[in-house]
Amino acid sequence: SSPCPQAWGPPGVQYGQPGRSVKLCCPGVTAGDPVSWFRDGEPKLLQGPDSGLGHELVLAQADSTDEGTYICQTLDGALGGTVTLQLGYPPARPVVSCQAADYENFSCTWSPSQISGLPTRYLTSYRKKTVLGADSQRRSPSTGPWPCPQDPLGAARCVVHGAEFWSQYRINVTEVNPLGASTRLLDVSLQSILRPDPPQGLRVESVPGYPRRLRASWTYPASWPCQPHFLLKFRLQYRPAQHPAWSTVEPAGLEEVITDAVAGLPHAVRVSARDFLDAGTWSTWSPEAWGTPSTGTIPKEIPAWGQLHTQPEVEPQVDSPAPPRPSLQPHPRLLDHRDSVEQVAVLA
C-alpha cells in the first residue's frame, strides 16, 4: 500500500502552502525506501536516494515555480510514481448568512473569506437549539446535527425545510480543502432572518371619473405559505414620473387607492411586504408598475363664481375579488380617511 495519505482532491495531486516547507511523497514505494526525484520534463536530479529522506522530497520555502509534476523512482530506476504539486492556503472560516422568505424554511449561503487556490468543498449541517426551562435562558443542542442539503450544480447554498418559527438553529458551514478545514457556526432564528419575497402581481389602474386617483392591487408572494396564522403587512410607494421622491403609505390589505396623484401624469408604484408582527425585515420592493389617473369629468352642478363646490367622494361600487391569500383586512378599504379630498373647480 502507498505510504502517501491521499488528501481530499484529485488523485496524484499533493498540496503545500507558499512560503512553507513542502514534503512530496512517492506513492509507489514502501515507506522509507530511498528514491530519486526529478521534475517532469527536466532531467537533472532534484534529490537523490542518499538524501536520508526516504520516499519524501522536501522543498524548502515552496513558491509558484515549484508547482508542477514530479517523478520519483526507486534505486534501480523503476518509476515510483508521478506527483503533481499544487500550492495554496488552508481554509479560512467562510462567510455565512442565512435568510428566510417564509416562516417554514430558510436557506444559508456562504463564500470563502479567503481564496485558498485549492479544490474546496463545504460541509453544511444544522441543529435545533431548544430552551430547557420556561424561565431558563440556557440553551442546549437537541438532537442533530442534521445535514443542510446543498443546492445542486455547486451553488453555495443549502436549505432547511420545515423549520420551526419560534426555534433557534445553529448552522455549521465547514470549508474543507486538502490542507485542512475551518468552521463557521452561526446562530439564527427564523424570526430575525425572515424577509418575505416582494408582493406579486402589482397592478395600477385609474379610477374612472377621478383624475387624482389610482387603484393599486397585488397578491401575496407565491413563496409565502398559505396559512392564516402568519400574515403579511405591506408598504406602498408611489411617485409621478420624473419626480425624485416617493410617497409612502401602509395599506391595510391587498389594495390601496391613491387619492393625491398628479392628474395627467403617469405614476410609478411599488410594494414591499413584511411579517405583520414585525419579525425580520421588509422585503425588497416589487418591480414598479405604472398607471395614469383618468381624465376628470365635468360635475353635474356648476358652482357660482367665487364659490368652490366640493363634490363628495362617492366611488362607484367595485366588485373587489377576495384576496387569494390571507391579509389583515381581507376586504381592503377603497377610501382612506387620510386621503385628501379631490376638489374640482370649474371656472366660467
Partner: antibody, heavy 117, light 107 residues
Framework: QVQLVQSGAEVKKPGASVKVSCKAS????????MHWLRQRPGQGLEWIGN????????HYNQKFKDRVTMTVDKSTSTAYMELSSLRSEDTAVYYC??????????WGQGTLVTVSS | DIVLTQSPATLSLSPGERATLSCRAS??????LHWYQQKPGQAPRLLIK???QSISGIPARFSGSGSGTDFTLTISSLEPEDFAVYFC?????????FGQGTKLEIK
C-alpha cells in the same frame, strides 16, 4: 535476468524509413523508461530520446524530433523506434536501453542501420 | 546543448597503474554526470552515476569525483579488462549528451 533483444540489421535507401524493435524480458516492462541511442561508426554516443514507462510520454532530442517516433506495445513488452527521411549520416548502430529517467542501465545488443543508395 | 569535452582522447597505461580520465562540461551541471565503459563490439556499461555514486556490480577500483564543470573518473589499479573506451554523459538538461570518449589503451 533483464534482456533487451533488438531486431536485425537493416539496409535502407535515402529518404526511406526504418523501424527498429526492442523486446524486453526479465522485468516489469511498464516500470522503466526506454531510451534510444545511436553510435555512428567510430563516433561517440548520441541520445535520440526516451519513452515513459506507463504513460508513453516521450522526450525527443530536438535534433531528431521531426523524424523520430517512439512507441511501445505493452502487451508484448516491445518498444519501437521509427526514424524517417533517412540520409547517409543516419548510418549507425541503434541501441535501446532500459533506464531510469536519464540513465541507461541495461542495453540491447544494437541494430546496425545502413543507409545507402 | 551542453557540450562535454573529454581528455585525453587517448590514454596509454600499463596494468596496475592508476588511470585518471577527465570530463569538462560547457556549463555547470552540478553532479548530474555519469560514466560508461564500452568495449569493442559491445554496448556501453554504466560505471558511476551522479559524479561519484557507485553502481552495483562495478568493481570498487572505479571511482568518480567532481561537481559543477570538472569531473574525474579514476581507476585505482588497472586490470587488463579495463582497457576500453570511456564516455561521460550529462543529465542536467535535454538533450542528454555524451563526451566524445577517452580510449584507454595498453601501453
Amino acid at each position: 535476468q533483464v534482456q533487451l533483444v533488438q531486431s536485425g540489421a537493416e539496409v535502407k535507401k535515402p529518404g526511406a524509413s526504418v523501424k527498429v524493435s526492442c523486446k524486453a524480458s526479465g522485468y516489469t516492462f511498464t516500470n522503466y523508461w526506454m531510451h534510444w541511442l545511436r553510435q555512428r561508426p567510430g563516433q561517440g554516443l548520441e541520445w535520440i530520446g526516451n519513452i515513459g514507462p506507463s504513460d508513453s510520454k516521450t522526450h525527443y532530442n530536438q535534433k531528431f524530433k521531426d523524424r523520430v517516433t517512439m512507441t511501445v506495445d505493452k502487451s508484448t513488452s516491445t518498444a519501437y523506434m521509427e526514424l524517417s527521411s533517412l540520409r547517409s549520416e543516419d548510418t549507425a548502430v541503434y541501441y535501446c536501453a532500459r533506464g531510469d529517467y536519464v540513465l541507461f542501465t541495461y542495453w540491447g545488443q544494437g541494430t546496425l542501420v545502413t543507409v545507402s543508395s | 546543448d551542453i557540450v562535454l569535452t573529454q581528455s585525453p582522447a587517448t590514454l596509454s597505461l600499463s596494468p596496475g597503474e592508476r588511470a585518471t580520465l577527465s570530463c569538462r562540461a560547457s556549463q555547470s551541471i552540478s553532479n548530474n554526470l555519469h560514466w560508461y565503459q564500452q568495449k569493442p563490439g559491445q554496448a556501453p556499461r554504466l560505471l558511476i552515476k551522479y559524479a561519484s555514486q557507485s553502481i552495483s556490480g562495478i568493481p570498487a577500483r572505479f571511482s568518480g569525483s567532481g561537481s559543477g564543470t570538472d569531473f574525474t573518473l579514476t581507476i585505482s589499479s588497472l586490470e587488463p579488462e579495463d582497457f576500453a573506451v570511456y564516455f561521460c554523459q550529462q543529465s542536467y538538461s535535454w538533450p542528454l549528451t555524451f563526451g566524445q570518449g577517452t580510449k584507454l589503451e595498453i601501453k
